[in-house]
């Protein structure tokens, strides 16, 4: 047979396909335990089984075999505190974001047999185990039950579930999607003797009905109760039912403090502080105004009291309350002071401790950088991420302050772990932070590392990703640079990604990914092998991301700017950021478009319709076209309301369909799921309408019964070969 | 020291109307779900309704559900249950009883209700 | 809804003696809602047990509760003459919440 010709590594790599894409070839691990104590973990193993791992002992073992999980399909577990059993979830079926219903099935691990008797019903809609022993409470049809055991019958603590018109203990839709991030609403104190539940009536709320076409000769009408800006919003009230003995006094409201009971309101989160004391935190309407509750249990009322002197006041004077969402409080251990994040004088958001009032604040973090989360606080101990680190706002670090000492002294745990690889991480802790895992998300390969949580010595890595390294060996990979452009008082963050053969000397076509919205971050350090990986890899097109103004942690002179006046600023600092890319020489004026999803539809839209001739084409997925349109908390948090008397101008001149003329001198394409139930398909009817009121040609496509995501693989695969021909066509690139 | 005391029973005709009463104190009435709970001349108890601490929540037997009304208020520590379209078989000592479902630890001394022709 | 059904109806016994009432339930009672009551000629009910075993306030340790299920028992280990009484369970498990007929302990 002919003999092997040697050929040199570089040349035998190859660029990306979009099918590796599609495929999600390169797709990347991460490892978080599920910590059951201080130094025990589960962990779902590769082949499914269930594994008990104890770091001090070393000790392993599988706690439920995979033929077990199989029996029952199960796709998910959650074992009881008192680890005598083990709910398995199976038939997962998704509902909006957070939301889905399941059957469940509990496992009686002392008799190794399901728990037979009084089987839970199906779908639930949420289940959790009390934090202690087994108790279980679970949302079915909209209405909370609870079992003292599993083998026990259920206890039905709420009648008023409705389906569409009144939730216990889950989030409707504009709560799961833009206050609570979650779908649950239902939270067990520590020691598990009482729940804690909202309840959010919609019956005045108007709805979103849309089609959904699926098999059948008559297409199905969806509706949900969805708030858009200035609708009637969800009446919310919470309860705390003693598990005990719920039948006894039944659930007992928590009193709303007055300040926010005067005009429409909010609940935005509950934190258990101890046994018999709960923070319950509220926010106006007008979303500037927050105010935390601390409310404790009276044995001889038998009620919740709320006292005035315990309640604490977070206002902003430039803005909203918050950053996306209103921080949580992290306690201490005396259950009464706590450690927040929220704006210092400067306007950066940094880690403050309450004693008594807001007024007294100790600020703990200080500078021209922003702590992002507190992870956990413990005796000594306060962990926390910021992106203070070489003042890269795109980083994640995780710090430690010793919060014993006086004064604290703070030490960065990861800045300097693998500092190449790894510049943006998260952290899961055991209980009182014995331990810790470290998730590192790039810019280089993912890594999960186990680390002693005295000493932060790393001791065990848990997953590295030593087969997509491999995989990737051959792979010609693009140059990624984040960088930063000034203009005028402005600093901008962009990523780059570069073809693998960039020559500064050569004229590249630019995308521009954009998504903008209101503290969001795109010019963050992490890895990713994705469509615009190999729109770089294999078109050889550079692309581009940049953090203008409205975007997070750098600030909230930088973050408020888009108050009240939202596809401004956004689309002007893309503009600014494309005049600069053009400047630096290797950028082909000619061929240069847009493309964003969501609010990143709403701005490359409005980017495309700016009339500045920069953009030869773009592409629009899912955008909002108007703030009318979408949900009443996210809208109205960052424009006010509707009303003549408040913002309604700018609402209207806003929108995507005022520039309808503007998008005659370039290619739009115009991308929306017909069963979007967050950006709802109207927002791109009403572009098209106007687009063809205007006379102005567009390609559009619509993907049939698909949400916000665009998620079923034949309707990805479709989306991007479709948005990647349309790309390469403007692009004038081959096929 | 914790009292209920009920008042408005009385002797009623068949398709009449009666409004109990039960002023409570010793306790903080607001934060106590209430029942009222009856017993027929000689016969075992029943559980009539119950209403949450606030009012908003009320449940009630099959045998009363559209006839009998339970309501409360906080202000003046009473508790109240509405009875219209009354029965023979609605004659009974009526019991008002501290508690949602169960665990009912205080009751009133009760007032005789007599439906009859 | 749920049937208690008591047992026996009327026990006849001397005090110093040794009460067991039952209460059977027609479908499963988990044990915080079963809870039972004492009650004298021409007075309100009293609440003697509350979660199937633990004594209310102010009840005296020679009543005592057991069972789980379907099966519930109230013991009391030595009458007194006070004891003498009608006695209910109750489930507060279901709505609408049920009682058992009464089990008449009376002097022999």
């Known amino acids: 047979r002919p003999s092997r010709v040697y050929k040199p590594e570089g040349n035998t790599k190859r660029a990306l396909t979009l099918k590796d894409i599609l495929n999600g070839t390169f797709s990347y691990k991460t490892y978080f335990p599920n910590w059951i104590s201080e130094q025990e973990y589960l962990h779902q193993s590769e082949d499914d089984n269930i594994v008990f791992y104890n770091i001090e002992t070393r000790e392993s073992y599988i706690i439920l075999s995979n033929s077990t999980m199989k029996s029952v399909n199960a796709t998910d577990y959650g074992l009881s505190p008192d680890r005598q059993f083990v709910y398995l979830e199976s038939d997962y079926s998704k509902l909006w974001r957070y939301s889905y219903t399941a059957t469940y099935y509990i496992y009686d691990l002392q008799n190794g047999e399901f728990v037979r008797g009084y089987e839970l019903p199906r779908p639930i809609q949420y289940l959790c185990w009390s934090p202690v022993g087994s108790k279980l409470a679970y949302v079915y049809q909209n209405n909370i039950y609870l079992k003292q055991r599993p083998g026990d019958p259920p206890f039905q603590i709420t009648y008023t579930g409705r389906e569409n018109r009144i939730f216990n203990g889950i989030p409707d839709w504009v709560y799961e999607e833009e206050m609570l991030a979650t779908k649950y609403a239902l939270w067990w104190s520590p020691d598990g003797k009482f729940l804690a539940y909202v309840e959010f009536n919609d019956s005045d709320i108007p709805i979103i009905a849309y089609s959904y076409y699926g098999d059948g000769q008559y297409p199905r009408t969806i509706n949900i109760p969805y708030p858009k800006a200035g609708a009637k919003n969800p009446v919310v009230r919470v309860f705390i039912v003693d598990t005990t003995y719920p039948h006894h006094v039944g659930p007992m409201e928590v009193p709303v403090p007055e300040m926010i009971a005067s005009s429409d309101y909010y609940f935005s989160w509950l934190t258990w502080v101890s046994s018999e004391r709960v923070c319950l935190q509220w926010l106006k309407r007008v979303q500037n105004v927050s105010v935390l509750s601390i409310c404790d249990f009276r044995e001889d009322w038998h009620a919740w009291e709320c006292p005035k002197n315990q309640e604490h006041v977070e206002e902003s004077r430039t803005g909203w309350a918050g950053g996306f969402f209103v921080s949580t409080p992290a306690f201490s251990q005396d259950a009464t002071s706590y450690y927040k994040i929220f704006s210092d004088k400067d306007g950066y958001k940094h880690i403050h401790y309450i004693k008594d009032t807001v007024e007294n604040a100790i600020q703990i973090t200080s500078g021209k950088w922003e702590a992002i989360y507190i992870f956990r606080v413990t005796q000594d101990s306060l962990f926390y991420s910021s992106n203070e680190f070489e003042g890269y706002p795109g980083r994640r670090n995780i710090y430690r302050i010793s919060i014993g000492n006086s004064p604290p002294s703070k030490k960065c745990v990861t800045c300097h772990l693998r500092k190449e690889r790894c510049q943006y991480y998260t952290a899961s802790f055991s209980y009182k932070a014995k331990y810790y895992a470290l998730v590192c998300y790039g810019p280089g390969l993912p890594i999960s590392t186990l680390h002693d949580g005295r000493t932060d010595q790393e001791i065990q890595v848990l997953e590295e990703n030593k087969e997509l390294e491999n995989s990737l060996r051959n792979i010609q990979l693009p140059k990624v640079e984040i960088k930063k452009l000034k203009d005028g008082g402005l600093t901008f963050w962009y990523k780059m990604i570069l073809p693998p053969q960039f020559d500064r000397s050569k004229k590249y076509p630019l995308l521009i990914q954009v998504y903008g919205g209101p503290c969001s971050q795109s010019v963050k350090s992490v890895f990713a092998v994705n469509w615009i990986t190999y729109l770089a890899s294999k078109e050889g097109i550079v692309i581009a991301l940049v953090d203008g103004r409205g975007t997070a942690f750098q600030g909230d002179k930088f973050l408020h700017a888009v108050y009240r006046k939202l596809g401004v600023y956004e689309v002007e600092d893309q503009l600014t950021a494309v005049r600069k890319f053009i400047e630096m020489g290797f950028i082909d004026e000619e061929r240069i478009a847009i493309w964003g999803w969501s609010y990143g539809g709403y701005v490359s839209s409005l980017a495309l319709a700016s009339g500045t001739g920069l953009f030869k084409c773009g592409i629009a997925v899912a955008p909002v076209s108007s703030w009318e349109y979408y949900a009443s908390i996210y809208s109205e948090r960052f424009m006010g309301l509707p009303t003549k008397d408040d913002n309604l101008e700018h609402y209207k001149n806003s929108t995507v369909m005022a520039r309808a003329e503007y998008f005659r001198n370039v290619d739009y394409l115009l991308i929306h799921g017909t069963a979007d139930d967050n950006v709802h398909f109207q927002n791109s009817a009403q572009i098209a309408k106007a687009l063809v009121n205007a006379q102005v040609d567009f390609q559009a496509m619509w993907y049939s019964d698909q949400n916000h995501g665009i998620l079923s693989g034949r309707s990805q695969n479709h989306l991007y070969t479709h948005m990647t021909h349309f790309l390469k066509q403007c692009f004038s690139l081959s096929d | 020291e914790v009292q209920l005391l009920e008042s408005g029973g009385g002797l009623v005709q068949p398709g009449g109307s009666l409004r109990l009463s039960c002023a409570a104190s010793?306790?903080?009435?607001?934060?106590?779900?209430m029942s009222w709970v009856r017993q027929a001349p000689g016969k075992g108890l029943e559980w009539v309704s119950a209403?949450?601490?606030?009012?908003?929540?009320?449940y009630y037997a099959d045998s009363v559900k559209g006839r009998f009304t339970i309501s409360r208020d906080n202000s003046k520590n009473t508790l109240y249950l509405q009875m219209n379209s009354l029965r023979a078989e609605d004659t009974a000592v009526y019991y008002c009883?501290?508690?949602?479902?169960?665990?009912?630890?205080?009751w009133g001394q009760g007032t005789l209700v007599t439906v009859s022709s | 809804e749920i049937v208690l059904t008591q047992s026996p109806g009327t026990l006849s016994l001397s005090p110093g003696e040794r009460a067991t009432l039952s209460c059977r339930a027609s479908?499963?009672?988990?044990?915080?809602?079963l809870a039972w009551y004492q009650q004298k000629p021409g007075q309100a009910p009293r609440l003697l047990i509350i979660?199937?075993?633990t004594r209310a306030t102010g009840i005296p340790d020679r009543f005592s509760g057991s069972g789980s299920g379907t099966d519930f028992t109230l013991t009391i280990s030595r009458l007194e003459p006070e004891d003498f009484a009608v006695y209910y369970c109750?489930?507060?498990?279901?709505?609408?919440?049920?009682f058992g007929q009464g089990t008449k302990v009376e002097i022999k």
């Open positions: 009883a501290k508690g949602w479902l169960g665990n009912f630890d205080y």
């Open positions: 010793g306790f903080t009435f607001s934060s106590s779900a």
């Open positions: 209403i949450s601490t606030n009012g908003n929540y009320t």
């Open positions: 479908q499963s009672v988990s044990r915080s809602y």
């Open positions: 979660g199937a075993s």
């Open positions: 109750q489930q507060g498990q279901v709505i609408p919440p049920t």
